[in-house]
């Protein structure tokens, strides 16, 4: 009898601090913690139909701690926010939302794109390429001598790869026709290899450059040089220098 009266009495006077759990300063049988020990945050935990007060050293996910003179309490972040500093500054959004300026958005504003890895709105990055490197030596079947017409190539590097919505990279290779130096090849002379022969393998994710090989260039409409007089040859050489053939795969 006495025991039951005691229990009833405790319910009528909920601010009983005897037998409080963990960090509670005051508590009740029905409501759990009513106040917390210094520096601990008060939070309400839903258990079935009722809410129980608990005292925590830090607030759970979706809440942030605020210290008032009379209570340190856990306050809910905005509905779309997973972790926050306060109501104004979310630091991690819930799934399906992107973080931008401390806010959670379902779509990123114009001029920004969604980074699905960090779940943030980030600036669109456009492709940046270097200046063209010098033209390679003019070669024909790998030789830099003879009277044949050959090809020369130049390349440039990608300095900044574009992000998903960024401008694609322009061609990084150019090939054009040229006239090989007018000198007879010595018997067994091996020509200097052109730059395009030495080209590195393309980076992962880059497609191979569609550079025609010397055979395909050779088969393009060509009047044999023997039929041309020197004056015509000179004229043709100038025209060919101006006719730059750009062949490349866009990155």
């Amino acid at each position: 009898q006495n025991a039951s009266r005691g229990r009833r009495q405790r319910r009528m006077h909920p601010n009983v601090s005897q037998g409080c759990q963990g960090g509670c300063a005051t508590c009740s049988d029905y409501n759990g913690c009513l106040s917390c020990k210094p520096r601990l945050f008060f939070a309400l935990e839903r258990i079935g139909m009722k809410q129980i007060g608990v005292c925590l050293s830090s607030c759970p996910s979706g809440y942030y701690g605020t210290r008032y003179p009379d209570i340190n309490k856990c306050t809910k972040c905005k509905a779309d926010c997973d972790t926050c500093f306060n109501k104004n500054f979310c630091t991690k959004c819930k799934s399906g939302f992107y973080l931008h300026l401390g806010k959670c958005l379902d779509n990123c504003p114009e001029g920004l794109e969604a980074n699905n890895h960090t779940m943030e709105c980030v600036s669109i990055v456009h492709c940046e390429v270097s200046e063209w490197n010098p033209w390679s030596p003019c070669t024909k079947k790998g030789k830099t001598c003879g009277f044949k017409r050959g090809t020369e190539t130049r390349v440039r590097e990608i300095i900044q790869h574009p992000s998903a919505k960024g401008n694609l990279c322009p061609p990084t290779n150019e090939t054009r026709k040229c006239t090989v130096q007018r000198k007879k090849c010595q018997k067994g002379e091996r020509g200097k290899k052109g730059r395009e022969r030495k080209r590195k393998k393309p980076n992962k994710g880059e497609s191979k450059e569609a550079i025609p090989d010397s055979k395909s260039l050779e088969s393009s409409k060509e009047i044999p040089e023997q039929r041309e007089n020197k004056q015509q040859q000179k004229k043709r050489k100038v025209q060919d220098k101006q006719k730059s053939v750009s062949v490349s795969t866009v990155h």
Partner: antibody, heavy 116, light 107 residues
């Protein structure tokens, strides 16, 4: 865009009263704790009072307790500071601000001069 | 009340300089510290919260460090628009208090 606009400042004699208002827009006013912060001419910043989001609790610095009352009308998106028994040392620019640990958004301020 | 003491009270520097402002608390405030910038005739503007978390839009030349009672605000390379008064603020305890300010002037 968050906007806080203070009004009600002016020149007042010591012992008299003044009521400052702060009109809020661009955010859900009723979700935010609000505060008044003041700055005496050529001096630093000084927190004056805070009212929690629903108006149920208020906090004051010791020097204004019993003289100043912070209140809010969430239906009008307006914060108030009723200042009674004004003293020369209350002379300052009074700013209203959102107060959620830090003072994130501020108004442009209103000048209160207490002088005989 | 927790007292915050900033040093120096004023500081002259040139564009491009690296500048450090310190804020010392009279007791442990853990990491509950913010920094504000105020220009003449304007309201303060929040720069940093939780010692070192930069507000979005604040240039990365601003950084904060420290814990407990000693904190610093560093501007790695001063720009003309950085000349202003800087305040620290603690929110570990009521009343929330500010430092007295550090006025950063052009040399």
């Amino acid at each position: 865009e968050v906007q806080l606009v203070e009004s009600g400042g002016g020149v007042v004699q010591p012992g008299r009263s003044l009521r400052l208002s702060c009109a809020a827009s661009g955010f859900t006013f009723s979700d935010y704790d609000m505060a008044w912060v003041r700055q005496a001419p050529g001096k630093g910043l000084e927190w004056v009072a805070t009212i929690i989001y629903d108006g149920s609790r208020t906090y004051y610095r010791d020097s204004v307790k019993g003289r100043f009352t912070i209140s809010r009308d969430n239906s009008k998106n307006t914060l108030y500071l009723q200042m009674n028994s004004l003293r020369a040392e209350d002379t300052a620019v009074y700013y209203c601000a959102t107060h959620d640990k830090t003072f994130d958004y501020w108004g442009q301020g209103t000048m209160v001069t207490v002088s005989s | 009340d927790i007292q915050l003491t900033q040093s120096p009270s004023s500081l002259s520097a040139s564009v491009g300089d690296r500048v450090t402002i310190t804020c010392r608390a009279s007791e442990d405030i853990y990491s509950d510290l913010a920094w504000y910038q105020q220009k003449p005739g304007k309201a303060p503007k929040l720069l940093i919260y939780d010692v070192n978390s930069l507000i979005h839009g604040v240039p990365s030349r601003f950084s904060g460090s420290g814990s407990g009672t000693d904190f610093t605000l560093t501007i790695s390379s001063l720009q003309p628009e950085d000349f202003a008064t800087y305040y620290c603020q603690q929110y570990d305890n009521y009343p929330n208090t500010f430092g007295q300010g550090t006025k950063l002037e052009i040399k």
